[in-house]
Amino acid sequence: QSPIFGPQDVSSIEGNSVSITCYYPDTSVNRHTRKYWCRQGANGYCATLISSNGYLSKEYSGRASLINFPENSTFVINIAHLTQEDTGSYKCGLGTTNRGLFFDVSLEVSQVPEFPNDTHVYTKDIGRTVTIECRFKEGNAHSKKSLCKKRGEACEVVIDSTEYVDPSYKDRAILFMKGTSRDIFYVNISHLIPSDAGLYVCQAGEGPSADKNNADLQVLEPEPELLYKDLRSSVTFECDLGREVANDAKYLCRKNKETCDVIINTLGKRDPAFEGRILLTPRDDNGRFSVLITGLRKEDAGHYQCGAHSSGLPQEGWPVQAWQLFVNEESTIPNSRSVVKGVTGGSVAIVCPYNPKESSSLKYWCHWEADENGRCPVLVGTQALVQEGYEGRLALFDQPGSGAYTVILNQLTTQDSGFYWCLTDGDSRWRTTIELQVAEATKKPDLEVTPQNATAVIGETFTISCHYPCKFYSQEKYWCKWSNDGCHILPSHDEGARQSSVSCDQSSQIVSMTLNPVKKEDEGWYWCGVKEGQVYGETTAIYVAVEERTRGSPHINPTDANARAKDAPEEEAMESSVREDENKANLDPRLFADEREIQNAGDQAQENRASGNAGSAGGQSGSSK
């Protein structure tokens, strides 16, 4: 096989030009040796038509050139004013004879079509660039070149080679020639706008000998992609505007009749109607980005457009992409509370719906942050460690098969106010947004723990009590030990349950938990809470510190505690130990496949690992009257 390479077949029409590029291996000898173009005869002989030594045959006189580009290891044969007689077999080659290294090229020149004023149609989108090709004959090589736009009978000059540019094309139109071509000039018109559409005429020379080409430019509005989404679900707009706007600010806007109102842009602008439920994520260095909107509402339906401009606002003549979003009101996603209210020091239980068909999917809860383009770092998940700053006060309770999971956050502060997202690694449509509003508390919390300064001594018995009001009388009370992978229910004893509901004494409604004997691993956060079946209610938290018995102090086992222990049978202790390997955060990459902005909180996995045995459940029993 020949190491020379080029086009095997070249086809054109009479009067046109061709530029045939031949590629050769990059060696010093090849760069400097003779290059040739010859025509293959019937007798097997290849007659030289042009060579790099300066030879030019009579039939090519005035219409052909051969140029070597040693830096690119190529040479180019330009042949103008083609006739049908130019049809034939040729070779482009290297060497002192025409038998050296060569490549066979077939050239076919057809008759000009019936319509000599063949109009070339250019179809471009708004904001893009068109390159209009204008061919001319050798005789007009040094003549003035121009492009004009037909307006009725007149043709108004857009640009010409004397550097004139029509004001409406200023900074958008350039006229240039390219490479070695001596029979073609180009006009680029960038940032196309609808009014640019129409018939253009490019011209080289003046009067009857002028060469003219017609070009019909069609400027298209982007065809909107149709998106059908359910109410309360989410939508992702994937925007790919091309490399030419990679460094410009990006935006997503919603079209009205006349304008397009920016919903979000990379300069920090965000429509308040989308607060807490929108994220903009750059995808790569080529200008691709995506916008995710959750908790779709009926009023979100409409025409959306993404674009790029340094201002971060829609600008005529800049590339755009369009969608039409339809929001189906017959949604499979259940209606859940969009606003949850809490008070400082109190707690909230947030119910997160998920696709019931995906009960084994991993569940997550993230905090939407407004900074930059919005992000949502994961705070807790079924296999994600609780984020730093939330230890002891945040837990996720999965209720397999119920189509919902509950997230409990206690020890609330006003800083907890904001937007939170429920999401899973399954059906991405099931993303719900909750706004948490935390107000200053004006009264004592419903649940109170005593003693409030909870320090237990190793080897001794330690009882902790949770006081609840009569309104929680009929609800199930529980104590649980908080660990990084949830809050594990512990055996406890409800003293209030022994009293009749008629004579509820506010002061004596107590649920107690006893650690007997106290072990070092009992140290940690404990929660007291109420629930009805799968519905979780108020919780309160207390940190129990565990210390060694000080030398010399007697081991006192309070008699009343012993008496209570005899009265109340010990309940079966619940296993609350945690296997080490289960406690690592392994977020499924599918969860974030199309939303990298939802940050993985599992990065602290190594430093936050819970100890192998999170609680000495065996020593915990209820013994309260």
Epitope: S11, N16, S19, I20, F69, N72, D118
Partner: nanobody, 130 residues
Framework: QVQLVESGGGLVQTGGSLRLSCAAS????????MGWFRQAPGKEREFVAA??????????YVGDSVQGRFTISRDAAGNTVYLQMNSVKPEDTAVYYC?????????????????????WGKGTLVTVSS
């Protein structure tokens, strides 16, 4: 979004023929050049054929290993390119990828270099059985 969709791949016997098609679609995508590359398992992507056009002039390029057996052509609109594969051999077994260029490149750019093509299809598998 520019999309190149290949079709026509499949199982063919040695000596047989196959015609691959590649349709360029997207927001009024009008390519300037389209081509075919192939990649056999464990091998580098190899140039097969390309077609480039400028006005009424068309240039067709064919790779050494398929010279005389494979031909490339396009439809009148210029948005679909075809690869006619004749006298196929077992060594033609590969995933065939379509490539396209939207903007005229510098005249010296070699169509055989995959890096110089802007858009790619997902590929279609051609298996030649002996």
């Amino acid at each position: 979004q520019v999309q190149l969709v290949e079709s026509g791949g499949g199982l063919v016997q040695t000596g047989g023929s196959l015609r691959l098609s590649c349709a360029a679609s997207g927001r009024t995508f009008s390519p300037y050049a389209m081509g075919w590359f192939r990649q056999a398992p464990g091998k580098e992507r190899e140039f097969v054929a390309a077609i480039r056009w400028s006005g009424a002039t068309t240039y067709k390029y064919v790779g050494d290993s398929v010279q005389g057996r494979f031909t490339i052509s396009r439809d009148a609109a210029g948005n679909t390119v075809y690869l006619q594969m004749n006298s196929v051999k077992p060594e033609d077994t590969a995933v065939y990828y379509c490539a396209a260029d939207r903007v005229p490149k510098d005249i010296s750019i070699d169509p055989r270099n995959p890096k110089d093509w802007d858009y790619w299809g997902k590929g279609t598998l051609v298996t030649v059985s002996s």
